[in-house]
C-alpha cells in the first residue's frame, strides 16, 4: 500500500480468483484513542472499533472510503483505490490503447517546435467518475523539471455505439535550449482512478522525435501564363522555432482530387513555393517536416485549385 | 559565444554541401546498423545515450544562432578554447566566434573519426563478419574536415591488445551512430544557418 | 492488371508524320496520367511529354513544342502521339508509360520502334 | 532544363557483390528523384521512387538514398537478373530529365 496524495491510498493486488489479497492497517488520524468507530463509504454498519481498523483488501467491495467516527462526529477520512496486477501486468481498462506508432500506446505527445512544450493526450470510453493526475520529468535518476498542466477533455467522438473522449494536457520543459541535443528522454507518468480503480501510465521520448509542425501558413496560388502550371507559395508556420534558418523545413506539395484514389502531381522541396500542375475540382495541399531529423509530417493546408 | 549574423556570401559557404552530405551518410549508416542488428538493442529506445564528446567540445553553445543567445536556457557554462584558421571562413568579417564554433565541429568530426575507426577494426575481425562501417561514412568525415581544414594534433588510433567483445562492441556502434546522428543535425543546422546569413 | 499495348514498328521518311498508338487496359483510363519517352538506339531516356486523358491537357518538352501533338480516344482507351517532320534522328523506340503520379512512370508499353530513313 | 548525370557509365561487379550506382543533379531537386531497370530489348521498369521509396514486388537489395544533388541507388547483393542498365529521373520540374544510364555488367 502506498499513498497517492493526502488521505487516498493505493492497495496494490494480484488479481487471480481466491487470492488472498492484501491485509491493510487504517490508523483514526486523531489524538482521541477511545470511543471510535469505523465506517465504509454511506454505509452505517460498523466495521470495527479502535484507533486502528485491520482489513483485509480482496475485491473493489474491500475498497472505498473508511471513515472513523466518535460520537456522531467524523474524525478523519481514508480511501482505499486498488491497482491489479494481472499475470504479473498492471491493468489497463481505463485509457483505449491507440496502437500508433506501435501496440500498448496509450499515451501519445506531440510537439510543434523544440521550445520544451508540449501536448499529450489519451483516449477512454469512461465518461463518468473519471481523475487524471499528470506529472512529468526530463530523465528519471537525477530528474529535471517539466511542468504540466491540468488535464481537461479536449473531444468527443462516436465510435459506433461507444463514445470515445479524448483527455489532453500541456507540459513545458522548465529550463529548455531549442538548440540543445537530447540525451535524457521526458518521461511523462499518468494517474488515472476510475471510481476505485487506480491505474497508470507512462510515455518516454526525446522532444525530437515527437516534432510535428503545424501546417504552412498563407498559401497562395500564381497562374503562370501559356501554361497549365502554377505557382504555389507559403510561409512557415508561426509557431516553428525560430530562426528558419537553423530550424529548417522541408516540404510536399500536392495537387489531388477529392478522392485519395485520384491521379495527383506531388513534389519535395526546401523552398516556400513550388509549380505544380492544376486541375479542375482539385485542390493543392503543402506540408511540412523538420528538414535534418525526419520526425513526423505536418497536417496538409489546402487551397482549392480554381 | 554565438554565431554573428555577417557571415559568408549566400551560396558560397563551402560546408554547406559537406554537412549535408554526412547527416545522409550517417542516417543510412544508423539504418543499416539498425536492420543489420536488428537482434541487438540498437533503437533509440533501447540504447543508452551517450555523447563522446561531452566536455571536450561545446558545439552546441560554440554554434548558438544569436538570436537563441537571449534564452538563458542556452547558454552553458563551459569554455573551450579551439585554434582559429579555416578554409569554410570565406569571408574576412568572419569573427572569433565562428571560427570557435566550426573548430569545435572539426575536434567533433576529428573524434568521431578516430572512435569509428578503431570501432571498424574490431569489426572487421569479427568471424561473423556482421556489419562494418559505411566506407562512404567515413569518407564523407574526411571530406568535411577537409573542407573545415583546422590543423590540430593528430589524435592516435586507439589499438587494444585484449581479445575485442563482438557484442560490446555493436552495442557501442549503435550508441556511436545514435549520438553521431544527432551531431550531424545540429551540424547541418548549423551550416544551414551559415549559409543564409 | 494494368497494361499499356502499343502500336507496330514504323518506316517513315524524313519530314513525313508518325502516330503511334497506346491501348490501355485493367484500369479506368482517365486514372492515370500517360506520358511518352523515347530512346534512340543504344541511347539513353527522353521525356517528350504527358496527356491527362481526363481532360486532355497537355504539357511537352519544349525541344518538341510545335512538332508533337498528344491526343487520347477515352471511348477506346487509347493514346496517340503525333510526331511531325521527322528527322532521321528521330529514329527511335517510343514508349507510352502511365501512372497516377505524374511526374514519375510506373506502367510502360513495351515501345514501338520508328525507323526514320530516306 | 535539369541535367542529371550518372557514373560510372560502366560498373563491373561479381555476383554477390555489393554495387553502388550515383546520380547527380545540376541543381537541389529535394528528393524529386526516381531510379528505373532498363533490360535489353525491355522497358524501363520503376525500382524506387522519390530517392528512397520501395515499390511493391522490387526485391529489398535494391535501396536508394540521397536529397538535394546527389543520389545513391544501391544493389546489396547483385543476382544474374540484376545486370542490366540504369537510369536515374528528376521530377522537380518540366521538362523530365533522365540520367544517361549506368551499365551494370559482369565481372
Known amino acids: 500500500i502506498w499513498e497517492l496524495k493526502k488521505d487516498v491510498y493505493v492497495v496494490e493486488l494480484d488479481w487471480y480468483p481466491d487470492a488472498p489479497g492484501e491485509m491493510v492497517v487504517l490508523t483514526c488520524d486523531t489524538p482521541e484513542e477511545d470511543g471510535i468507530t469505523w465506517t465504509l463509504d454511506q454505509s452505517s454498519e460498523v466495521l470495527g472499533s479502535g484507533k486502528t481498523l485491520t482489513i483485509q483488501v480482496k475485491e473493489f467491495g474491500d475498497a472505498g472510503q473508511y471513515t472513523c467516527h466518535k460520537g456522531g462526529e467524523v474524525l478523519s477520512h481514508s480511501l482505499l483505490l486498488l491497482h491489479k496486477k494481472e499475470d504479473g501486468i498492471w491493468s489497463t481498462d481505463i485509457l483505449k490503447d491507440q496502437k500508433e506508432p506501435k501496440n500498448k500506446t496509450f499515451l501519445r505527445c506531440e510537439a510543434k517546435n523544440y521550445s520544451g512544450r508540449f501536448t499529450c493526450w489519451w483516449l477512454t470510453t469512461i465518461s463518468t467518475d473519471l481523475t487524471f493526475s499528470v506529472k512529468s520529468s526530463r530523465g528519471s535518476s537525477d530528474p529535471q523539471g517539466v511542468t504540466c498542466g491540468a488535464a481537461t477533455l479536449s473531444a468527443e467522438r462516436v465510435r459506433g455505439d461507444n463514445k470515445e473522449y479524448e483527455y489532453s494536457v500541456e507540459c513545458q520543459e522548465d529550463s529548455a535550449c531549442p538548440a540543445a541535443e537530447e540525451s535524457l528522454p521526458i518521461e511523462v507518468m499518468v494517474d488515472a482512478v476510475h471510481k476505485l480503480k487506480y491505474e497508470n501510465y507512462t510515455s518516454s521520448f526525446f522532444i525530437r522525435d515527437i516534432i510535428k509542425p503545424d501546417p504552412p501558413k498563407n498559401l497562395q496560388l500564381k497562374p503562370l501564363k501559356n501554361s497549365r502550371q502554377v505557382e504555389v507559395s507559403w510561409e512557415y508556420p508561426d509557431t516553428w522555432s525560430t530562426p528558419h534558418s537553423y530550424f529548417s523545413l522541408t516540404f510536399c506539395v500536392q495537387v489531388q482530387g477529392k478522392s485519395k484514389r485520384e491521379k495527383k502531381d506531388r513534389v519535395f522541396t526546401d523552398k516556400t513555393s513550388a509549380t505544380v500542375i492544376c486541375r479542375k475540382n482539385a485542390s493543392i495541399s503543402v506540408r511540412a517536416q523538420d528538414r535534418y531529423y525526419s520526425s513526423s509530417w505536418s497536417e496538409w493546408a489546402s487551397v482549392p485549385c480554381s | 559565444r554565438n554565431l554573428p549574423v555577417a557571415t559568408p556570401d549566400p551560396g558560397m559557404f563551402p560546408c554547406l554541401h559537406h554537412s549535408q552530405n554526412l547527416l545522409r551518410a550517417v542516417s543510412n549508416m544508423l539504418q543499416k546498423a539498425r536492420q543489420t542488428l536488428e537482434f541487438y538493442p540498437c533503437t533509440s529506445e533501447e540504447i543508452d545515450h551517450e555523447d563522446i564528446t561531452k566536455d571536450k567540445t561545446s558545439t552546441v553553445e560554440a554554434c548558438l544562432p544569436l538570436e537563441l543567445t537571449k534564452n538563458e536556457s542556452c547558454l552553458n557554462s563551459r569554455e573551450t578554447s579551439f585554434i582559429t584558421n579555416g578554409s569554410c571562413l570565406a569571408s574576412r568579417k568572419t569573427s572569433f566566434m565562428m571560427a570557435l564554433c566550426l573548430s569545435s565541429i572539426y575536434e567533433d568530426l576529428k573524434m568521431y573519426q578516430v572512435e569509428f575507426k578503431t570501432m571498424n577494426a574490431k569489426l572487421l575481425m569479427d568471424p561473423k563478419r556482421q556489419i562494418f562501417l559505411d566506407q562512404n561514412m567515413l569518407a564523407v568525415i574526411d571530406e568535411l574536415m577537409q573542407a573545415l581544414n583546422f590543423n590540430s594534433e593528430t589524435v592516435p588510433q586507439k589499438s587494444s591488445l585484449e581479445e575485442p567483445d563482438f557484442y560490446k562492441t555493436k552495442i557501442k556502434l549503435c550508441i556511436l551512430l545514435h549520438a553521431f546522428r544527432i551531431r550531424a543535425v545540429t551540424i547541418d543546422r548549423v551550416m544551414s544557418y551559415l549559409n543564409a546569413s | 492488371q494494368v497494361q499499356l499495348v502499343q502500336s507496330g514498328a514504323e518506316v517513315k521518311k524524313p519530314g513525313a508524320s508518325v502516330k503511334v498508338s497506346c491501348k490501355a487496359s485493367?484500369?479506368?483510363?482517365?486514372?492515370?496520367?500517360l506520358h511518352w519517352v523515347r530512346q534512340a538506339p543504344g541511347q539513353g531516356l527522353e521525356w517528350m511529354g504527358w496527356?491527362?486523358?481526363?481532360?486532355?491537357?497537355?504539357e511537352y518538352a519544349p525541344k518538341f513544342q510545335g512538332r508533337v501533338t498528344m491526343t487520347t480516344d477515352t471511348s477506346t482507351s487509347t493514346a496517340y502521339m503525333e510526331l511531325r517532320s521527322l528527322r532521321s534522328d528521330d529514329t527511335a523506340v517510343y514508349y507510352c508509360a502511365a501512372n497516377k503520379e505524374l511526374r514519375y512512370f510506373d506502367v510502360w508499353g513495351q515501345g514501338t520502334m520508328v525507323t526514320v530513313s530516306s | 532544363e535539369i541535367v542529371m548525370t550518372q557514373s560510372p557509365a560502366t560498373l563491373s561487379v561479381s555476383p554477390g557483390e555489393r554495387a553502388t550506382l550515383s546520380c547527380r543533379a545540376s541543381q537541389s531537386i529535394s528528393i524529386n528523384l526516381h531510379w528505373y531497370q532498363q533490360k535489353p530489348g525491355q522497358a524501363p521498369r520503376l525500382l524506387i521512387y522519390?530517392?528512397?521509396q520501395s515499390i511493391s514486388g522490387i526485391p529489398a537489395r535494391f535501396s536508394g538514398s540521397g536529397s538535394g544533388t546527389e543520389f545513391t541507388l544501391t544493389i546489396s547483393s547483385l543476382q544474374s537478373e540484376d545486370f542490366a542498365v540504369y537510369y536515374c529521373q528528376q521530377s522537380n520540374s518540366f521538362p523530365l530529365t533522365f540520367g544517361g544510364g549506368t551499365k551494370v555488367e559482369i565481372k
Open positions: 522519390f530517392a528512397s
Open positions: 496527356i491527362d486523358p481526363e481532360n486532355g491537357d497537355t
Open positions: 485493367g484500369y479506368a483510363f482517365t486514372d492515370y496520367y
